[in-house]
């Protein structure tokens, strides 16, 4: 039993880091493998993560963490029984993938304006809370070419757009994702999408 692709890990910078790797053949990850992780810190203990299958030869492990700070470094040991398959380390602050925003809502009752709001996925005491920026994706269910991205570079988790920038009388969907420049993070996953019917009063044309 050998590791084909070494574990790569990302942290949500809150409570979970996710490590993925591939074995050289079909593996029952949860029964055959264990990933031990330990914070490099005085009097810390090793903790065990039981991996799950992620495709035939792929494994994924969700490492629980109390919290994350920039100096944290973890040692990682991948075991198959008594055999050490791989040894490495992981610094969460250097491999951050933020949590996806939630509760995306489209408010259509503001006159001719669409107000999209969502929730910051971090509590106020987390460092990323005040460092997230967002991308909002809006697309038409009827027209694949009607697909747009709005970059939200301010901290408030909301976006206002004129309803008239979208076509009237058809359904749209929106989703949002986040990233943090301060840690050069990857983008989060997209939030669940939300749907609404776009309708607004056409302005009277004067001839």
């Amino acid at each position: 039993m050998k590791v084909l692709q070494e574990p790569t890990c990302v942290s949500d910078y809150m409570s979970i880091s996710t490590c993925e790797w591939k074995m050289n053949g079909p593996t029952n990850c949860s029964t055959e493998l264990r990933l031990l992780y330990q914070l490099v810190f005085l009097l810390s203990e090793a903790h065990t993560c039981i991996p799950e299958n992620n495709g035939g030869a792929g494994c994924v492990c969700h490492l629980l963490m109390d919290d994350v700070v920039s100096a944290d470094n973890y040692t990682l040991d991948l075991w198959a029984g008594q055999q050490l398959l791989w040894k490495g380390s992981f610094k969460p602050s250097e491999h951050v993938k933020p949590r996806a925003p939630g509760n995306l809502t489209v408010h259509t009752n503001v006159s001719d304006t669409l107000l999209l709001t969502w929730s910051n996925p971090y509590p106020p005491d987390n460092y990323l809370y005040n460092h997230l920026t967002y991308a909002v994706n809006i697309w038409s269910e009827n027209d694949p070419a009607d697909f747009r991205i709005y970059n939200v570079t301010y901290l408030e988790p909301s976006l206002r757009i004129a309803a008239s920038t979208l076509k009237s009388g058809i359904s749209y969907r929106a989703r949002v994702r986040a990233w943090a420049q301060c840690y050069n993070t990857t983008w989060s996953e997209w939030s669940p999408s939300t749907k609404w019917h776009n309708s607004y009063r056409e302005p009277f044309e004067q001839h």
Epitope: L42, L43, E45, L64, D66, D67, V69, S70, A71, D72
Partner: antibody, heavy 125, light 112 residues
Framework: EVQLVESGGGLVQPGGSLRLSCAVS????????MSWVRQAPGKGLEWVSS????????YYADSVKGRFTISRDNSKNTVYLQMNSLRAEDTAVYYC??????????????????WGQGTTVTVSS | DIVMTQSPLSLPVTPGEPASISCRSS???????????LDWYLQKPGQSPQLLIY???NRAYGVPDRFSGSGSGTDFTLKISRVEAEDVGVYHC?????????FGQGTKVDIK
């Protein structure tokens, strides 16, 4: 009520051995790291050794490395310090102390918040 | 190893007056979780050490509020706002960030 009671000290010749014990009550012993600290006559405090709650992490001062062994029995709520090849400079009062919570991913530190009464080790011919 | 340096080494005090002890570390004791891994202990004559302050500024349970700890990084101070007769003994600072734990030389506080 938290209590730590050391025993096992005494007079021993250079090169001899002693085993100190620290019996603990009043807290969830297996969740906490434990430490040994000593104090030579008329001197300051010197840390000797520490062990994590599960026993997997062990640390020693350079002055005792290779001669002293720390261990614990969580079923007996007791931490031990096996001292071999004793030297005159090991003469001291030995204290055990309750250390940080070590079962969390990041150990939670609240100081060495409880100490035993100490046991005296004298190394002399 | 981290070297801890206390001053003064001896401090005669007058009951009711304030007192202050300094502790300097050769290494930054502020970890990125925001905590300074620096403690203060009092060893009264003939007794075991007892914890006064942990993580730089947190008073241990049962410690009178006349004791306070301050400082960050490498420079720390223990203050007693109004010394009482029962406060005599040797005060030790200790760093708990790295192995080996290291103590200051101790400051002997006694009544003038």
């Amino acid at each position: 009520e938290v209590q730590l009671v050391e025993s096992g000290g005494g007079l021993v010749q250079p090169g001899g051995s002693l085993r100190l014990s620290c019996a603990v009550s009043g807290f969830t012993f297996s969740s906490y790291a434990m430490s040994w600290v000593r104090q030579a006559p008329g001197k300051g405090l010197e840390w000797v050794s520490s062990i994590t709650g599960g026993g997997g992490g062990i640390y020693y001062a350079d002055s005792v490395k290779g001669r002293f062994t720390i261990s614990r029995d969580n079923s007996k709520n007791t931490v031990y310090l096996q001292m071999n090849s004793l030297r005159a400079e090991d003469t001291a009062v030995y204290y055990c102390a309750k250390d940080r919570i070590s079962i969390t991913i990041r150990p939670r530190y609240f100081g060495l918040d409880f100490w035993g009464q100490g046991t005296t080790v004298t190394v002399s011919s | 190893d981290i070297v801890m340096t206390q001053s003064p080494l001896s401090l005669p005090v007058t009951p009711g007056e304030p007192a202050s002890i300094s502790c300097r570390s050769s290494h930054n004791l502020l970890y990125s979780n925001g905590y300074n891994y620096l403690d203060w202990y009092l060893q009264k004559p003939g007794q075991s050490p007892q914890l006064l302050i942990y993580l730089g500024s947190n008073r241990a349970y049962g410690v009178p509020d006349r004791f306070s700890g301050s400082g960050s990084g490498t420079d720390f101070t223990l203050k007693i706002s109004r010394v009482e007769a029962e406060d005599v003994g040797v005060y030790h600072c200790m760093q708990a960030l790295q192995s080996p734990y290291t103590f200051g030389q101790g400051t002997k506080v006694d009544i003038k």
